[in-house]
Interface confidence: medium
């Protein structure tokens, strides 16, 4: 099956916008928007720090770490209020992602 221009293959995602701003207190705030064509039972999420189609149950129950959102070698830690997760690099640097 041929894809029309701008059409995504089933189960794939692409980054639409990536804004970086406001480097305050050595923190860079990045906002990313993605477009996904997910299969039934899937929903847009993050895997290995990239937009991906993930099991919808993960999103419903806010078990964010089950998406494997961090890079290989990083540790995933759920924020207690379930608003997102942190990825801890081997050197100890922590990157926090919140879902909106």
């Amino acid at each position: 099956q041929f894809l029309k221009e701008g059409q995504l293959a089933a189960g794939t995602c692409e980054i639409v916008t990536l804004d970086r701003c406001c480097n305050k207190n050595r923190r860079t705030i990045a906002r990313q928007t993605a477009r996904c064509a997910c299969r039934k039972g899937q929903i847009a999420g993050t895997t290995r720090a990239r937009p991906a189609c993930v099991d919808a149950r993960i999103i419903k129950t806010k078990q964010w770490c089950d998406m494997l959102p961090c890079l290989e070698g990083e540790g995933c830690d759920l924020l207690i209020n379930r608003s997102g997760w942190t990825c801890t690099q081997p050197g100890g640097r922590i990157k926090t992602t919140t879902v909106s």
């Epitope: 078990q63 830690d77 759920l78 207690i80 942190t86 801890t88 922590i94």
Partner: antibody
């Protein structure tokens, strides 16, 4: 085997502070969120609070919010509960609890400590 | 808050069902905790709806139907006599997600 060993309980005075420590062994401590649950004499279980794996995030039950601080030392495999401005209703047994997955909730505790008894009385 | 019966009783070998309903976070499931005496530590018999720790006998199982969760003990034994607490999470704008437990169900083996 997973073991959680609490210490620091005993007789405390109202208005004072207590510090409880839970020493963990038998699992990779830094890979699990941890929490504290307490039980007043003759009563049910009450959520005290939790801490995430890195120690950067905590949450507390309404009865202790503003008075409790939970911290952890992944190098020493310990989690600490500090409770200030003690009241008689803080009397009870305090249990250390381990989450079963990448998070801890009252539905995902898979291991408990033996508990340490705290009595708040003048 | 979570609602569970205050007591249930059964003869050895019978099947016992203890229900738990309520809570604000059914997606995260329910846990069941056994306490044999007021001075002893709880023991997890079921966590995350239906997961059973490796040292818990297979006669203990958990199931969920809607917002009600059921702990089933198939072929109850004398040593199962205890208080059983269910656990879940509730959400409040003040405290966020906070763990909640039922008041406990006393199981008597006749």
């Amino acid at each position: 085997a997973v073991t959680l060993d609490e210490s620091g309980g005993g007789l405390q005075t109202p208005g004072g502070a207590l510090s409880l420590v839970c020493k963990a062994s038998g699992f990779t401590f830094s890979s699990y969120q941890m929490g504290w649950v307490r039980q007043a004499p003759g009563k049910g279980l009450e959520w005290v609070g939790v801490i995430n794996k890195s120690g950067s995030d905590t949450s507390y039950g309404s009865a202790v919010k503003g008075r409790a601080t939970i911290s952890r030392d992944n190098g020493q495999s310990t989690v600490r509960l500090q409770l200030n401005n003690l009241r008689a209703e803080d009397t009870g047994t305090y249990f250390c609890a381990k989450g079963s997955a990448s998070y801890i909730t009252a539905a995902t505790i898979d291991a408990w400590g033996h508990g340490t008894e705290v009595i708040v009385s003048s | 808050a979570l609602t569970q019966p205050s007591s249930v009783s059964a003869n050895p070998g019978e099947t016992v069902k203890i229900t738990c309903s309520g809570g604000g976070s059914s997606g995260y499931g329910y846990g069941w905790y056994q306490q044999k005496s007021p001075s002893s530590a709880p023991l997890t018999v079921i966590y995350w709806n239906d997961k059973r720790p490796s040292d818990i006998p297979s006669r203990f199982s958990g199931s969920k139907s809607g917002s009600t969760h059921t702990l089933t003990i198939t072929g109850v034994q004398a040593e199962d006599e205890a208080v059983y607490f269910c656990g879940n999470d509730d959400y409040s704008s003040d405290s966020g997600y906070v763990g909640v437990f039922g008041a406990g169900t006393t199981l008597t083996v006749l």
